[in-house]
């Protein structure tokens, strides 16, 4: 009957024996033998291996392509890939930040509920009754209509979701 060999979590089975895996930041150059330990080599500059591995090549660090609006957020190391993010005014369109999109401004009649971040777009909401927004903006919220009453004035023109109330002097009673 064939023997069942179980290796530890940082080992692998090769030719019937347990060999040590290469450490993160390195790659395999030769499997272990009865006399020799697993031989590994450190990843070269611009390369990485993030896991315990038995791979003969390290992975290339990611390039953050400026033409796609990307920039380096965190430089890669021998054990980790480069992390990209988007330039100012843009946000990532996927979890891995493979591309960027311009932040969307909230149009008149809509206010900013949540400002855009490097990973999320602006969240807009329609201005409710009593509030307005008269411009396209990445950060302006809906503002309350002016209270003509508080200023001892009367409403000359009603407000909308896009315009403020226009107040004027109360007409004298004759």
């Amino acid at each position: 009957l064939g023997q069942c060999v179980t290796c530890s979590d940082k080992q692998y089975l090769h030719d019937g024996q347990c060999c040590d895996l290469c450490q993160p930041g390195s790659r395999l150059t030769s499997h272990c033998t009865a006399l020799e330990k697993t031989q590994c080599h450190p990843c070269d500059s611009g390369e990485f291996s993030a896991q315990w591995n038995r791979e003969i090549r390290c992975h290339q660090h990611r390039h953050c392509e400026p033409n796609q609006g990307l920039r380096v957020k965190k430089e890669g190391t021998a054990e980790s890939d480069t992390v990209c993010t988007c330039k100012e005014g843009q946000h990532c369109t996927s979890k891995d930040c493979e591309a960027c999109a311009q932040h969307t401004p909230c149009i008149p009649g809509f206010g900013v509920m949540e400002m855009a971040t490097e990973t999320t777009d602006t969240v807009c909401h329609p201005c409710p009754v009593g509030f307005f927004s008269n411009q396209s903006s990445l950060f302006e919220k809906c503002y309350p209509w002016t209270s003509c009453e508080d200023k001892n004035l009367e409403v000359l023109q009603k407000g909308t979701s896009q315009t403020n109330v226009i107040c004027g002097l109360k007409s004298r009673m004759r």
């Epitope: 530890s8 895996l21 290469c22 930041g25 390195s26 330990k37 697993t38 031989q39 450190p42 054990e79």
Partner: nanobody, 125 residues
Framework: QVQLVESGGGLVQPGGSLRLSCAAS????????MGWFRQAPGKEREFVAA????????YYADSTKGRFTISRDSARNTVYLQMNSLKPEDTAVYYC??????????????????WGQGTQVTVSS
């Protein structure tokens, strides 16, 4: 042939600090994965801390986590072990070790193929 020389040991009061150094010479690479181990009289050699060749990853024994910090200066080919909040149970001979084949679990003594002579650390009032 890699040579490792430890220094910085000594007598310190409980709650005190020490910084151990391990200077490496004679290797193919400027940096190897390095580990610190310790051995108290009558006890097994015990893992303390380790650092990857690039310095990007560090590993600690549960007993030293939060108190000890391993670091490296690749330009000087030196690995350091900053030991704070020392306790009497930290008393031991401290050894540094190098792994020239870049494989194996950091916490296993068998992973390392070169060892220093050791430096004595005594924590006592």
């Amino acid at each position: 042939q890699v040579q490792l020389v430890e220094s910085g040991g000594g007598l310190v009061q409980p709650g005190g600090s020490l910084r151990l150094s391990c200077a490496a010479s004679g290797g193919t690479f400027s940096s190897y994965p390095m580990g610190w181990f310790r051995q108290a009289p009558g006890k097994e050699r015990e893992f303390v801390a380790a650092i990857s060749w690039s310095g990007g990853s560090t590993y600690y024994a549960d007993s030293t986590k939060g108190r000890f910090t391993i670091s490296r200066d690749s330009a000087r080919n030196t690995v350091y072990l900053q030991m704070n909040s020392l306790k009497p149970e930290d008393t031991a001979v401290y050894y540094c070790a190098a792994n020239t084949h870049f494989s194996g679990a950091f916490e296993h003594a068998r992973t390392y193929d070169y060892w220093g002579q050791g430096t004595q650390v005594t924590v006592s009032s």
